[in-house]
């Protein structure tokens, strides 16, 4: 079905359209049950309740209503370039016999959760497989979704972005069963250049693809590792040229700062990956802000003048909760001739594997 | 309807910093990106970048990363652009747009005059 | 960043003529391609977005095509009021623009 909400212009800013399905555990006399249901034809937006966002707000929100006291709320939020469902929450009424018969107690309950819909800004987001958002002894399932918040003129944008689940997946392989991790592993990250400049001319050349690995611990007490890959298209890099420090500053999606330091030894004349530092936000967690650093490493190391290369994947440790997994790596600091790289020096890891 | 009135023209000296406003009305002020371009006649049309004034999130070009900053009050639904260090080349006209990325529904300021001379 | 080349930096054209311009971005922009008039004195002016969307009001004698990286803007029954400044813009990733192509009418 298709629910829109609309401003006082008679403006739409939220357009969806799909069918949902609710999975709900409770408890009858004889003891627990689960009731599945779909959402009704009859479902309607809650006008009153439903927002386009106030002044000075950002959080237009749809509210769905039905049978007897139902509501599937979604809540929005976003970014300077994404947006994104932040909140799902569904509130039901075990007093509703028609849903929930034998229900021993007749109280209304809600249950929220965050979830993965979100979409760059002026695309739709678009889902045909079911998206599954799992609430305490609720299960939402949307099919067949087609959702887009802050609309320009009132229609569903020609471009979209897709769901993780609908995208190919590079290797067919059996179902998993669903896995309490917010996000699925994703694939290896795209390799990028990067380069920072000085007024003495480059003083960083790098290519690499870069995954963070994070742990930490979310609302609901769980603990969750989530690894998420840098994406280069939305991402812009900087940097500063030191005698003794080089530095490459990434600002990707989410507010996300990934900051890498190499440092040299003048003795020996060798460069190396020195410190690296994160700040980035987690919506999930139970301290959303989430920030690692370490300025004590040893990494990527290679005589000035000559560039490290490593095809294989390298785990840099940074803390206890968080690594970065480099891909193809290929990088030179401090010395850098003709803004090309130098003579390779190759990892152990590739030359084990010749 | 949707209107940017931006601050009016400026005369400043190399080295300097200029701060230039841009207060929007006739829509919810943190709906949408504001971006800034500047137009001059030796280099053109260049983006510099874009604040969302819901949470202060502010992309910038590379090229203007390290001299602009974005800022945006909610309060009075005005968004400002500091540059600084400034040289005779940053002599054009700069305007904010009303976008979030797609550009079909974009509404263009009047354009701020910055000229840099000793 | 994504860089668009534009070419050429200038071209001149007779009254009822044809000119055509290309933008080429440095990676795949997914049709996110718009393109603007420019005239001194004045703001610039929305003609083509999508890649081949007209802006309405603007007259069928503008038109605009391409996929990937490869793009191109059309002018055609040229008309004096044609002179000025056209800059091609790519939206997919940030905002980039051309560097923009001075036309002249012979």
């Known amino acids: 079905a298709m629910f829109i909400v609309k401003n006082g212009n008679g403006t739409a800013c939220i357009m969806a359209n799909f069918s949902a399905a609710f999975s709900v555990n409770y408890d009858t006399k004889s003891g627990p049950k689960n009731m599945t249901f779909d959402l009704p034809s009859d479902a309607k937006v809650v006008l009153n309740s439903s927002s386009c966002g106030k002044e000075n707000t950002s959080d237009p929100s749809l509210v769905i209503a039905f049978g007897r006291g139902q509501t599937l709320t979604l809540n929005f939020t976003r970014n300077a370039t994404r947006y994104s469902v932040q909140l799902m929450s569904f509130v039901y009424n075990l007093s509703d016999t028609h849903l929930f018969p034998n229900a021993s107690s007749k109280e209304i309950k809600t249950v929220e959760s965050i979830t993965d819909i979100r979409a760059d800004i002026d695309k739709k987001y678009r889902c045909v497989s079911g998206t599954q958002v799992h609430m305490n002894n609720v299960t939402v399932t949307l099919h067949d979704a087609t959702i887009q918040a802050y609309l320009s003129n009132s229609s569903f944008s020609r471009e979209e972005t897709r769901c993780e689940q609908d995208r190919p997946s590079p290797t067919t392989a059996p179902p998993a069963p669903p896995s309490p991790s917010p996000s699925p592993v994703p694939e290896s990250p795209s390799v990028d250049k990067y380069n920072v400049s000085g007024t003495n001319g480059t003083c960083l050349l790098a290519s690499m693809g870069l995954q963070l690995n994070l742990t930490y611990e979310r609302k609901d007490n769980t603990t969750v590792t989530r690894l998420l890959n840098i994406n280069p298209n939305k991402t812009l890099a900087s940097g500063s040229c030191g005698a003794h420090l080089v530095t490459l500053e990434l600002h990707s999606e989410g507010s996300t700062v990934l900051l890498f330091q190499f440092g040299m030894n003048a003795s020996s004349s060798r460069f190396f990956l020195q410190g690296i530092q994160l700040n980035t936000t987690l919506p999930d967690a139970r301290d959303p802000a989430f920030k690692a650093a370490n300025s004590s490493l040893r990494a990527l190391q290679a005589t000035v003048g000559n560039s490290y290369k490593c095809n294989a994947e390298e785990h840099v440790r940074v803390t206890k909760a968080f690594s970065v997994n480099i891909f193809k790596v290929w990088v030179q600091a401090f010395k850098v001739e003709g803004g090309q790289f130098g003579s390779v020096e190759e990892c152990l890891l590739d030359e084990n594997n010749m | 309807q949707v209107q940017l009135v931006q601050s009016g023209a400026e005369l400043v000296k190399p080295g300097a910093s200029v701060k230039m406003s841009c207060k929007a009305s006739g829509y919810i002020f943190t709906n949408y990106n504001i971006h800034w371009v500047k137009k001059s006649p030796g280099q053109g049309l260049e983006w510099i970048g874009a604040i969302y004034p819901g949470n202060g999130d502010a992309p910038y070009s590379q090229k203007f990363q390290d001299r602009a900053t974005l800022t945006a009050d909610t309060s009075s639904s005005t968004t400002y652009m500091e540059l600084s260090s400034l040289t005779s080349e940053d002599s054009a006209v700069y305007y904010c747009?009303?976008?979030?990325?797609?550009?079909?529904?974009?509404?263009w300021g009047q354009g701020t005059l910055v000229s840099v001379s000793s | 960043d994504i860089q668009m080349t534009q070419s050429p930096p200038s071209l001149s054209a007779s009254v009822g003529g044809k000119v055509t311009i290309t933008c080429k971005a440095s990676q795949d922009i997914d049709r996110y391609m718009a393109w603007y008039q420019d005239k001194p004195g004045k703001g610039p002016k929305l003609l083509i977005h999508?890649?081949?969307t007209l802006q309405p009001g603007i007259p069928s004698r503008f038109s605009g095509s391409g996929s990937g990286r490869d793009y191109s803007f059309s002018i055609s029954n040229l008309e004096p009021e044609d002179i000025a400044t056209y800059y091609c813009l790519q939206y997919d990733n940030l905002w980039t623009f051309g560097g923009g192509t001075k036309l002249e009418i012979k």
């Open positions: 747009v009303r976008a979030n990325w797609d550009v079909a529904f974009a509404y």
């Open positions: 999508d890649t081949s």
